[in-house]
């Protein structure tokens, strides 16, 4: 049945409005012409005032924000939770990779510990920081690891007669490490694998975090005055006539929402592309593009690189003996 | 060959030699995330319709509000929506997105470009140079297993993916996500007491 005729005393309108704005006498006692109204233009007497219109416009914008937040809740939850899971999972991978590498040193080259532990620790700390977006160069990280390791390998394994903490010779050995390609092509191999896998991991996390930012931005959009007026007409102007339970016509709602969201809908094209590009990236995250695979295998490649040094130990010791003779003499004097 | 580091770990269970069916791995989790994200691919284009369907609009009522008056739901007046004298909808659309939306579009463009740059072209997962440098030994790679360790005695075949998700304290079943709607059919004269905003029938 049609709703009852508008309240002759505006009493019910007052009751409803009072919940939004308690204590203020903004509601007329009886219906008025409403000639000052700008949004809820009346066809006859109305129970609304200009102040009420303003309150309804504020309410309309708040309600729209609530509706947007409710619309995006599931999507937001999905991305936030996954971003957290992947970040933690990547940290676990790094922790395991570090442990594996330390264990490899402890079991195979006990004489290199604890210095090796320190260098390995620094390397994997940098790996973690890089994934989280730090401005670190992966090649530098790998070079630093091998630059630090070689003096220890040389002084502990290849030439154990040298006094410890020979700073001068350490510097010379660091330089010789690169010039003589002491570890063969292993450092380059590690650089390629680590940089490719970490780049992909980093961009994956960056993309998830941007996804959260996109949803957060649209969640808290401030809608234009025109949109606020349109929403007010659709949702609240009926109250001015004492019609609290009537609902907007479906087509009318669609037109209003399309008008209000014309700008937001422009995100659509780029959002689609974002999901499809992310899918492409994920499809390629295997073998050397999978940090899990690369980092958990690092201990083995490092082990091979040390074996390579040992295999060429005799030749290397002679060459380095000549190359770094000056440093050694200074030290013995 | 490397003596495989076993004695240091409490979590030796992570290193599985046998292939475990349905094991949840990072790569499977990534694929699962993408599948779920793809169900939101039309999120922004569908938003106006979604909001209308999740706020009260006249469905079963004979009368509805068109912005100015109460009208028959299927009448001309319902379609005209009472807006003609008030706001120029075309003008509203022509204004273009507001600065924050433009900013977010720029950020999306940027990340999309990065993602495309980083995406591995099909069939090019391994660079030739790496092949030559002996990254792949050739005899390790069935399913998701890879060789960790150098060739020769003592090679250990290890499950490629860590079973992290046992370690992670998250349960990401989105069916339990807060805000998940129960899209039950609303019978006439009944209310589904859900928590969507504007929860009237």
């Amino acid at each position: 049945q049609p709703p009852p005729p508008p309240d002759a005393t505006c009493h019910q309108v007052r009751s409803f409005f009072q919940r939004l704005q308690p204590g203020l006498k903004w509601v007329p006692e009886t219906p008025v012409p409403g000639s000052d109204l700008q949004v809820c233009l009346p066809k006859g007497p109305t129970c609304c005032s200009r102040k009420m219109e303003e309150k309804y416009q504020l309410t309309a914008r708040l309600n729209m924000e609530q509706l947007l937040q409710s619309a995006s809740m599931e999507l937001k939850f999905l991305i936030i939770q996954n971003a957290a899971v992947f970040q933690e999972a990547f940290e676990i991978v790094v922790r395991h990779a570090k442990n594996y590498t330390n264990a490899m040193f402890k079991n195979n080259y006990p004489s290199l510990t604890p210095q090796a532990f320190e260098f390995v620790g620094e390397f994997f700390t940098d790996v973690s920081l890089y994934i989280l977006g730090s401005d670190i160069n992966v090649d530098d990280m790998v070079n630093e690891l091998f630059d630090s390791l070689f003096p220890v390998i040389y002084t502990q394994m290849m030439n154990p007669g040298l006094p410890e903490s020979v700073l001068d010779i350490n510097e010379c050995l660091r330089g010789a490490r690169r010039d003589l390609k002491v570890f063969g092509s292993f450092p380059k191999l590690i650089m390629t694998q680590v940089s490719k896998s970490l780049q992909v991991t980093r961009i994956f996390l960056q993309a998830l975090n941007l996804g959260i930012e996109v949803i957060n931005t649209t969640d808290h959009l401030k809608f234009s005055k025109d949109c606020g007026r349109m929403l007010t007409r659709m949702w609240y102007c009926s109250y001015c006539q004492g019609l609290m339970m009537v609902k907007p016509c479906g087509g009318y709602c669609n037109v209003v929402m399309q008008g209000c969201m014309a700008g937001v809908v422009e995100i659509d094209k780029y959002w689609r592309e974002y999901i499809l590009s992310l899918e492409e990236l994920v499809n390629g995250m295997y073998r050397i593009y999978d940090m899990e695979n690369v980092l958990l295998g690092l201990f083995s490649t490092i082990h091979d690189s040390i074996q390579y040094v040992q295999k060429n130990g005799g030749k290397l010791t002679t060459t380095i003996g000549k190359l770094c003779a000056h440093s050694q003499q200074r030290q013995y004097r | 060959s490397a003596y495989y580091p076993e004695d240091l770990f409490i979590d030796k269970k992570i290193l599985k030699v046998a292939h475990v069916e349905h094991e949840e791995t990072l790569s499977s989790r990534r694929r699962e995330l993408i599948q779920k994200l793809k169900s939101f691919i039309n999120f922004y284009s569908a938003l106006p319709g979604y909001i209308c369907s999740h706020s009260p609009v006249a469905e079963n009522d004979t009368l509805c509000w068109n912005g100015q008056e109460l009208v028959e739901r299927y009448s001309q007046k319902a379609a005209r929506n009472g807006m003609k004298n008030q706001f120029n909808l075309h003008e509203l659309k022509m204004k273009g997105p507001e600065p924050v939306v433009s900013q977010i579009i720029d950020k999306l463009k940027h990340i999309n470009q990065l993602l495309r740059t980083m995406s591995v072209p099909k069939g090019k997962v391994l660079d030739k140079s790496l092949d030559e440098e002996g990254l792949e030994s050739g005899d390790c790679g069935d399913d998701e297993d890879e060789c960790i360790g150098s060739s020769g005695d003592g090679m250990v075949k290890v499950k490629n993916q860590l079973r992290f998700l046992a370690e992670l304290a998250y349960d990401l079943d989105v069916d339990d996500a807060p805000g998940n709607k129960q899209h039950g059919n609303q019978k006439d004269n009944e209310i589904t007491t859900s928590h969507s905003v504007g929860n009237m029938p």
Epitope: H11, Q12, R19, N63, M244 | -
Partner: antibody, heavy 118, light 105 residues
Framework: EVQLVQSGAEVKKPGSSVKVSCKAS????????ISWVRQAPGQGLEWMGG????????NYAQKFQGRVTITADKSTSTAYMELSSLRSEDTAVYYC????????????????WGKGTT | ETTLTQSPGTLSLSPGERATLSCRAS???????LAWYQQKPGQAPRLLIY???SRTTGVPDRFSGSGSGTDFTLTISRLEPEDSAVYYC??????????FGQGTK
């Protein structure tokens, strides 16, 4: 599904105050309206007042005006009702209830109730 | 001030019988804003009917509401043992904002 969990029973001396809490879970707390209703032993239901957290605006029944304060904390999804200058006739079960709303305007029906605080 | 008067105070019926509960307002009430609640001993009230005649989810169809103006009725067509409770009507929109009837047991 929305649930309202109320604080535990209280015993107070005449003249003192009591503050009862009502924590909501599920749904969007800020867009609810929350009402407080009390029931004296063997008596009927009596509306005390209500609040819409998103606005922070509270309404009170004339009878309790000046003696009751209803507040809400959006960050913890909790509504509070404080009653001061307690008298023996304030002995009752105090319920919080979520009101239905349409576009943030409460429609007066209370569809989800807490278990009550004595 | 709007008051709601419920009658009878107590109603004793057997399972399968029809129960008719009345709620009368001192002023005309919009049927959109009249509700019925059920309260069992030791429990919180439960919303049964809103807008005078609309059932909420999960409420059996043996419960129905009707009426307008000042006279409203809750009918339970075939009583079940679990329907034993106190029933309250409630209005919204007139001073005081919310008013409950005194209840029918």
């Amino acid at each position: 599904e929305v649930q309202l969990v109320q604080s535990g029973a209280e015993v107070k001396k005449p003249g003192s105050s009591v503050k009862v809490s009502c924590k909501a879970s599920g749904g969007t707390f800020s867009s609810y309206a929350i009402s407080w209703v009390r029931q004296a032993p063997g008596q009927g239901l009596e509306w005390m007042g209500g609040i819409i957290p998103i606005f922070g605006t509270a309404n009170y029944a004339q009878k309790f005006q000046g003696r009751v304060t209803i507040t809400a904390d959006k960050s913890t999804s909790t509504a509070y009702m404080e009653l001061s200058s307690l008298r023996s006739e304030d002995t009752a079960v105090y319920y919080c209830a979520r009101e239905w709303q349409q576009q943030l305007v409460p429609l007066g029906y209370m569809d989800v109730w807490g278990k009550g605080t004595t | 001030e709007t008051t709601l008067t419920q009658s009878p105070g107590t109603l004793s019926l057997s399972p399968g019988e029809r129960a008719t509960l009345s709620c009368r307002a001192s002023h005309s009430v919009s049927s959109n804003f009249l509700a019925w609640y059920q309260q069992k001993p030791g429990q919180a009230p439960r919303l049964l009917i809103y807008a005078a005649s609309s059932r909420t989810t999960g409420v059996p169809d043996r419960f129905s509401g009707s009426g307008s103006g000042t006279d409203f009725t809750l009918t339970i067509s075939r009583l079940e043992p679990e329907d034993s409770a106190v029933y309250y009507c409630q209005q919204y929109g007139y001073s005081p904002l919310y008013t409950f009837g005194q209840g029918t047991k």
